[in-house]
Amino acid sequence: TLNSVLNSNAIKNLPPPLGGAAGHPGSAVSAAPGILYPGGNKYQTIDNYQPYPCAEDEECGTDEYCASPTRGGDAGVQICLACRKRRKRCMRHAMCCPGNYCKNGICVSSDQNHFRGEIEETITESFGNDHSTLDGYSRRTTLSSKMYHTKGQEGSVCLRSSDCASGLCCARHFWSKICKPVLKEGQVCTKHRRKGSHGLEIFQRCYCGEGLSCRIQKDHHQASNSSRLHTCQRH
């Protein structure tokens, strides 16, 4: 199913590169190279001029969602698709445009009072409470942070960065996504390009903190492309 690659607990053998490229609105995390799943990477090169590849909704813009471009298509080649307007078919909330949510397979306008009640019944802030407290519906919902009573602390399972407390972002870790610290000056970060064949990256780092950008470390300029170390540096 498409849902399997989109939210917290997905473990992937086929997804495109994780993490957004510079300037892409949905970019919240960067993926650390070198911590890979065993087995070959079946994801092949996606040309620069094709739509932006993704592995999950949060890598796309606010008016997009992540899915295979063709019905029943290869789950390993997913791209950011335009969100679906009111009364269009959907499978999960993220497919619907802002101000709407998915109800009974159709995008409908968010009735805040109804939706808030629904969320309060099904969402738990941390999976430290184990998944026995959650039902299948709640694990696939995509929520704005104001739907939560509390923000996730470091180590809490999350769906989006807005679920995490200040100074944290929601980043993939193996088969789940947890709140991790935003990177500080001097910390190693991962710079992504929009094209190229990548190994499967399943450990994501957060983005660099405010006033910092992910750049090649000065003393690494002479190194080969494959070993260039990027760190968070002042603009």
Partner: antibody
Amino acid sequence: QVQLVQSGAEVKKPGSSVKVSCKASGYTFTEYTMHWVRQAPGQGLEWMGVIDPSNGDTSYNQKFKGRVTITADKSTSTAYMELSSLRSEDTAVYYCSSTTGPWFASWGQGTLVTVSS
Amino acid sequence: DIQMTQSPSSLSASVGDRVTITCRASQDISNYLNWYQQKPGKAPKLLIYYKSRLHSGVPSRFSGSGSGTDFTFTISSLQPEDIATYYCQQVHTLPPTFGQGTKLEIK
């Protein structure tokens, strides 16, 4: 309440295969990954691999060099772990574990597999 | 693979004692450390995840600390039902690996 019920004990000959099942209930089977961990008698715990039941994606511990295969049947909410080319060192209790975050929260009761000629 | 080394391998303590178990990783694992309790003939049980976060339903006498390569698991006041083997587990890098265990007995 999450419940994982595993199949019964098995006695196998060296060189043969064993397939252990793990039936899940109390949650939506496709929502959580299922891991397999083994424990040889008097020994520690060893992670074997994991499956995402929603699409069948798997990842294995390379130590088992293609001897282990993990599958899942969504229709019966059951995960399976098959270990081939059995040797005496594979005598162990095999556990399934259903989980959400990077930790193993819910466990099956364990299945003892004895490999003996 | 990352090696996890626990110490001591066994220890004996009295009810009410403060008990400490250490776990050392062969490389930096940040906070990606979990602790499990296993009683004879039973499956392991998650106690602490992400270094120091208490799993649901776990008594507050259990705690975890440390970072990087050195971690500590503490039982502030040992109870008879705490007799078990305790395992640390790293989930920083695949494959997840466990320590060899610490067997805790009552004096």
